[in-house]
């Protein structure tokens, strides 16, 4: 007999064909010989089956000798052998209905686990293979699990259920809730305004939750909460903010914080956490602030950086358009008795300048000017 695979909630067409290309009498029954539907002349008649309100046919195909049974909103328990009786013949079709669902919500936090569960009719022995949006294949039986979801797992998961050499495909949209970047670093000269942005890697209709930015200044012994805020339907409202520094926060997404001035005492690392309504766990983004200061005191020209710098970063002092006078993998460099002219302090990574501060050194009889 013919095997047809269906998906829970879907619509399926079971075909039945007569040799005569005209409308003749037919009827469909289930394995218990209960009539589902048939015809009486041109009228569609229905029997007392459980499918009554979900069974249909297509009158326009009867004239072609086709007498389909269409079952809408399929349920697992619709799995059965269906018999079409036409022209003193019986055609049997075995329908197997499968369902594939995500364990909980399809919106999961980065690092959480995804479990896909297959619902199948008794007596079936299907195999399942799923392909993630980044092309990773996972195989299993009744359940498939993926631990430690990553941002790249967001998107459509395509799962193929195989049974009796037939296959049925499911598509499940998974949204991994995370910030676009796990970590970011901002480089600023002393006194400059600092902008921190925390763009989300997903979009949802309504976004509600609360968040906080904790800051560990390099110079401080312990971390401190700089700001707490609420998020209601994508609208941001500040709950509490420290007096020093007095951060400002944008009212709309993406989450946006402004520090009026970059000062050495603020250099350090922050951790922004966002707890979303009806979700266990929090989203995290690390943010780092590196501050540079160039100063001239008497005969000493000094350049310093504060904050989390990598050991491979190079700090240099050079006179404009000349070779670097000093260049070290350290957080402070200086030049004694600097020549007059425009000096540049550069923080660079493999030749790429990350931060630059200029200071004008005047002839010895003058005082220095900082542009």
């Amino acid at each position: 007999k013919k095997v047809v695979l269906g998906k829970k909630g879907d619509t399926v067409e079971l075909t039945c064909t007569a040799s005569q290309k005209k409308s003749i009498q037919f009827h469909w029954k289930n394995s218990n010989q209960i009539k589902i539907l048939g015809n009486q002349g041109s009228f569609l008649t229905k029997g007392p089956s459980k499918l009554n309100d979900r069974a249909d046919s297509r009158r326009s195909l009867w004239d072609q000798g086709n007498f389909p049974l269409i079952i809408k909103n399929l349920k697992i328990e619709d799995s059965d052998t269906y018999i079409c009786e036409v022209e003193d013949q019986k055609e049997e079709v075995q329908l197997l209905v499968f369902g594939l669902t995500a364990n909980s919500d399809t919106h999961l936090l980065q690092g959480q686990s995804l479990t896909l569960t297959l619902e199948s009719p008794p007596g079936s022995s299907p195999s399942v293979q799923c392909r993630s949006p980044r092309g990773k294949n996972i195989q299993g039986g009744k359940t498939l699990s993926v631990s430690q979801l990553e941002l790249q797992d967001s998107g459509t998961w395509t799962c193929t259920v195989l049974q009796n050499q037939k296959k049925v495909e499911f598509k499940i949209d998974i949204v991994v809730l995370a910030f676009q970047k796990a970590s970011s670093i901002v480089y600023k000269k002393e006194g400059e305004q600092v902008e921190f942005s925390f763009p989300l890697a997903f979009t949802v209709e309504k976004l509600t939750g609360s968040g906080e930015l904790w800051w560990q200044a390099e110079r401080a012994s312990s971390s401190k909460s700089w700001i707490t805020f609420d998020l209601k339907n994508k609208e941001v409202s500040v709950k509490r903010v420290t007096q020093d520094p007095k951060l400002q926060m944008g009212k709309k997404l993406p989450l946006h914080l402004t520090l009026p001035q970059a000062l050495p005492q603020y250099a350090g690392s922050g951790n922004l956490t966002l707890a979303l309504e009806a979700k266990t766990g929090k989203l995290h983004q690390e943010v780092n602030l590196v501050v540079m200061r160039a100063t001239q005191l008497q005969k000493n020209l000094t350049c310093e950086v504060w904050g989390p710098t990598s050991p491979k970063l190079m700090l240099s002092l050079k006179l404009e358009n000349k070779e670097a006078k000093v260049s070290k993998r350290e957080k402070a460099v200086w030049v004694l008795n600097p020549e007059a002219g425009m000096w540049q302090c550069l923080l660079s990574d493999s030749g790429q300048v990350l931060l630059e501060s200029n200071i004008k050194v005047l002839p010895t009889w003058s005082t220095p000017v900082q542009p």
Partner: antibody, heavy 115, light 107 residues
């Protein structure tokens, strides 16, 4: 909830080929037939043809020689091509889901044939 | 092809009126008939199928009846949002065909 979204060129010259595509979002694609219907300005509705997920088609005999309906099941999309258009093919073209009745419908695309 | 003929082609009525639109098929179509409502610039909307079954969400003031060749759509008490064009459609055989439409206007 099933939604149909259609697109295609809105202005054609006589003898050109009309080409429209309809995407189906939500619901079952495989269990239904997918139709094209047109409505000339201020006039009634004319059924053009239909296709199912496996590519089985039925066409209106009055247009059959010029019509091709195709399907891309992987994208839940189906398309209409109508060749050698004339001014008489100017109409709003609709896509729709069908078993026996048309429901739901796409938003419609006005196609004007003019030299 | 089965011809579907609607009458009248237009009708003027007032809010609260009872309105009946008829559709005649050129041959027996049993109960394979649907009714649609269309407002200007919009796609048609299914109201009644299988001659007398309500599509979900359709107000109960709409009803359909008939079998064979003669069918009626009745609106028991016209509401302002009911002023539109109504079409019948047969699903008995290919090609599917529609009536020419009945325009329901405010008196």
């Amino acid at each position: 909830q099933v939604q149909l979204q259609q697109w295609g060129a809105g202005l054609l010259k006589p003898s050109e080929t009309l080409s429209l595509t309809c995407a189906v979002y939500g619901g079952s694609f495989s269990g239904y037939y997918w139709s094209w219907i047109r409505q000339p300005p201020g006039k009634g509705l004319e059924w053009i043809g239909e296709i199912n997920h496996s590519g089985s088609t039925n066409y209106n005999p009055s247009l059959k020689s010029r019509v091709t309906i195709s399907v891309v099941t992987s994208k839940n999309q189906f398309s209409l091509k109508l060749s050698s258009v004339t001014a008489a093919d100017t109409a709003v073209y609709y896509c729709a889901r069908v078993l026996n009745w048309f429901d739901p419908w796409g938003q419609g695309t006005l196609v004007t044939v003019s030299s | 092809d089965i011809q579907m003929t609607q009458s009248p082609s237009s009708v003027s009525a007032s809010v609260g009126d009872r309105v009946t639109i008829t559709c005649r098929a050129s041959q027996d179509i049993a109960d394979w008939l649907a009714w649609y409502q269309q407002k200007p610039g919009k796609a048609p909307k299914l109201l009644i199928y299988a001659a007398s079954s309500f599509q979900s969400g359709v107000p109960s003031r709409f009803s359909g009846s008939g079998s064979g060749t003669d069918f009626t759509l009745t609106i028991s008490s016209l509401q302002p949002e009911d002023f539109a064009t109504y079409f019948c459609q047969q699903a008995n055989s290919f090609p599917y065909t529609f009536g020419q439409g009945t325009k329901l206007e405010i008196k």
